[in-house]
């Protein structure tokens, strides 16, 4: 494995490319910070099925980020 020093991100690996929209309870976006140098998109699944990291480069993640940013600003 390539080893390098970085902050503690919440996700391990690149994340899933897509999640069924019907399964999504909530989407949270974590922007780059001192803790983690990349954007992370965390999906909370319905019916207590836990959480999944969505690949921030995926089409679905980009749509979610856009949607959240429009809502917030």
């Amino acid at each position: 494995f390539p080893m390098f020093k970085r902050g503690r991100c919440l996700c391990i690996g690149p994340g899933v490319k897509a999640v069924k929209v019907a399964d999504i309870e909530k989407a949270s976006i974590m922007y780059p910070s001192n803790n983690c140098d990349k954007i992370e998109v965390i999906i909370t699944l319905k019916e207590n099925k836990g959480q999944r990291c969505l690949n921030p480069k995926s089409k679905q993640a980009r749509l979610i980020i856009k949607k959240v940013e429009r809502k917030n600003f």
Epitope: F1, M3, C9, L10, P14, G15, K17, G50, Q51
Partner: nanobody, 126 residues
Amino acid sequence: EVQLVESGGGLVQAGGSLRLSCEASGFTFDDYAIGWFRQAPGKEREGVSCCSSSDGSTYYADSVKGRFTISSDNAKNTVYLQMNSLKPEDTAVYYCAATQGLLIATMWNPASYDYWGQGTQVTVSS
């Protein structure tokens, strides 16, 4: 079809070493986090080590820190678990498991993993 196949288990004396292999097929290796779990008779399955081959993250349960090392060979689609200074309490069936979109907070939860191997038995005698 996704498949994980473990090998390398066996009988070893306390203080000895073993290297387990987990060969993956049917998916893009870099997209997945692959972890090692173990289950001793009458006990729950517990996380031992976890990593992602794409970003170099490695994590260890406190019980194996400093003794076990996880590594991978992307060309061979294989993850290894090097186990040194083995103790009788390390006796268990060892499984590798793979998933996408894993969070650090849930990496020791077997329910977070989508695919599992059949397991390989490790027995450490005193």
